[in-house]
Structure formats: C-alpha cells, structure tokens
C-alpha cells in the first residue's frame, strides 16, 4: 500500500508539473481535475503545488493561480465568474477524453474561493478504505 501511495504521488506530481503542456495528451490532467472537483481539494500537498505551472501563472504580482477544478462553488455567490468561467469548464469534467487546447485552460486566483486542502489525505484515506 505504501508503494501504491508513492506511485500515485509521483503520477500526480508529474501531471501537475506537465499540466497544459501537451494539448493532445490531456487524459491524466482531466482525470486529476475531476479528482480535485469531486474530493473538494486542490493540489497534492497544498494548492501551492500549482504555482510552478507556467501556463496557469498570472503576471507579476498576480502570479498565483490554480485550475478551475480547485474552485469552491459552494463558497461563492459571484455569478459572473460562475456563469462565464467556471461552470462551462467544470461541465467538461464528465467528458475526460476530449482533447483540449492551452487556450481552453481555466485558471482562477489562488486567493479567492478555492479548496485549501491538498488531495493527498483524501486519496490516502480512499486507498485505505478500498
């Protein structure tokens, strides 16, 4: 089980590092988006895992951004960002096989309404129970 957890962590960390770099190979990314969305978590250890991903990064002082699958829908009533940005992206999470282009990548400020827990604990708990 420890070996399985290590392997899972390695796969997830690699998926995060390479997020958005190959529009033709997005199955792992979209699967991870789905995990974050379903488990209500963000990143492996912490949301900060995403800050090294250049394609998500904002300019200058607004650098810290995470994928929209980290967005906590229940914590906001900001209908503009929900209707225009988040919901169209999250509706795609059920269609994991669809190819995606880098222009489609949806990111939100990490200081806004996001899940602040990393996914490691939730996934480890799930592994222990199965």
């Amino acid at each position: 089980r420890a070996q399985l957890e290590r392997s899972l962590r390695d796969v997830v960390e690699k998926t995060i590092q390479k997020y958005g770099t190959n529009p033709e190979e997005t199955a792992a990314e979209e699967s991870w988006d789905y995990v974050q969305f379903q488990l209500r978590c963000c990143g492996w250890h912490y949301p900060q895992d995403w800050f090294q991903v250049l394609i998500l990064r904002g300019n200058g002082s607004e650098a810290h951004r995470v994928p929209c699958s980290c967005y906590n829908l229940s914590a906001t009533n900001d209908s503009t960002i929900l209707d225009k940005v988040i919901l169209p992206q999250l509706s795609r999470l059920g269609h994991l096989a669809r190819s995606r282009h880098s222009a489609d990548i949806c990111a939100v400020p990490a200081e806004s309404h996001i899940y602040r827990e990393g996914c490691a604990q939730g996934l480890q708990k799930w592994l222990h129970n199965n």
């Epitope: 002082s61 607004e62 309404h113």
Partner: antibody
Framework: QVQVQESGPGLVAPSQTLSITCTVS????????VSWVRQPPGKGLEWLGV???????NYHPSLKSRLSIKKDHSKSQVFLKLNSLTAADTATYYC?????????WGQGTLVTVSS | DIQMTQSPSSLSVSVGERVTITCRAS??????LAWYQQKPGKSPKLLVN???NLADGVPSRFSGSGSGTDYSLKINSLQPEDFGTYYC?????????FGQGTKLEIK
C-alpha cells in the same frame, strides 16, 4: 490603484486587546487575500496571519490562541485583534494585499504596549 | 515551522558591483518564495515571487533563482537606490515565515 491603510491605537496597556483596522481600495476582498505582518523596533519581519477571499484564515502557530482576523466586504475593511498583550507585542503592524506574496503594503501603524 | 536562514546578515558593496543574497529553508518549499526590499522607515516592497517571477515595476537588474531548499536574489549592477534590508519569505504549507534579513549598505 491599490491602496492599503492601517489605523491603530498607538498605545495599549499590557494584558489588553489590540484592535487594528485595515482599509483597502483598488481591489476586491472577495478575490484577494489580506495578510498581517509586524516588525518590532530595529528587528525583522514576523508573519502574523492571512484572511483569504472566502473568509478562511491561517494564523502564526504561536499566536493562534491570541489572534483573530476578520473582514467586512461592504466597508472594504479587514480587522486584526490580538489579546493578552505584553511588551513583546510592541511593533509596527502592517497589513498587505496578498495571501502568499505580499504585493502592496500599508505604511504601518506603531503599537506600543506599556502601562 | 519552516525556518528560513538568510546569509549574509549584512554586506557593504560598491555601486556597479554584483550582489548575491541567499536564503535556505529548513525543508523543501517547492519554489514558494518571495523577496522583499525595505528601506529605513518605509514599508517592505515585493521584488520577486514564486522564486523567480519579477514583481510589477521591479528593475531587470534584480533576479531570483533556486529550488528545493536553496534560493538566491541577485542584483546585477548595484545602484545607489538599492541600499536597504532584504528579506526572503516562504509560503509553503499553511503558515509562512520570513528570513532574518540581509542589510545591504553602499560602500
């Protein structure tokens, strides 16, 4: 443009509670974190805590039991409360826009704890 | 608590010279590091975030580098306005800490 300004009491008696207000403009408290940092006279910077866009908070472990950070979106204000003050809490207190890196700082308010 | 150790604690350098300030974290902080400059009696100013990303309006003579536990801030050709105290700050985990500061004086 972004502006951040602290207002505090200046002098507080030992064992009392410190209350500082941070008034912001040029950005939304719903999408940005606001952090608090203090600096004792002649010393370095100490991170106190942050309040995120969703209202959740992170606190310095050793101050957790004494520190509270809240905000009022309608007034664009963030509030710091630190109780059971001692002379060691004498410092300039800063609030800053940003939860991770701190991009815009207020001018700071000097708080002296003394009877 | 992650500890941040800066070195040197102070240095005196001539205008035009190159300066390197280093910051070591007590554990891997995965590039979640910022650098600030503070002048006497003033508030700190953000220079760099995510270890290498220059903040808005910061001159290109400043650059950040590093990964894992070891990070550095370089000033390529020191200008008179670059004097002050420099601080690193990590933001990995759920609580952040600053380094103790490096005081840079112009020779």
């Amino acid at each position: 443009q972004v502006q951040v300004q602290e207002s505090g009491p200046g002098l507080v008696a030992p064992s009392q509670t410190l209350s500082i207000t941070c008034t912001v403009s040029g950005f939304s408290l719903t999408t940005s974190g606001v952090s608090w940092v203090r600096q004792p006279p002649g010393k370095g910077l100490e991170w106190l805590g942050v309040i995120w866009g969703d209202g959740s908070t992170n606190y310095h472990p050793s101050l957790k039991s004494r520190l509270s950070i809240k905000k009022d979106h309608s007034k664009s204000q963030v509030f710091l409360k630190l109780n059971s003050l001692t002379a060691a809490d004498t410092a300039t207190y800063y609030c800053a826009k940003g939860g991770y890196s701190l991009a815009h700082w207020g001018q700071g308010t000097l708080v002296t704890v003394s009877s | 608590d992650i500890q941040m150790t800066q070195s040197p604690s102070s240095l005196s350098v001539s205008v035009g010279e190159r300066v390197t300030i280093t910051c070591r974290a007590s554990e891997n902080i995965r590039s979640n590091l910022a650098w600030y400059q503070q002048k006497p009696g003033k508030s700190p100013k953000l220079l760099v975030n995510v270890a290498t990303n220059l903040a808005d309006g910061v001159p290109s003579r400043f650059s950040g580098s590093g990964s894992g536990t070891d990070y550095s801030l370089k000033i390529n050709s020191l200008q008179p306005e670059d004097f002050g105290t420099y601080y690193c700050q990590h933001y990995w985990g759920t609580t952040w800490t600053f380094g103790q500061g490096t005081k840079l004086e112009i020779k």
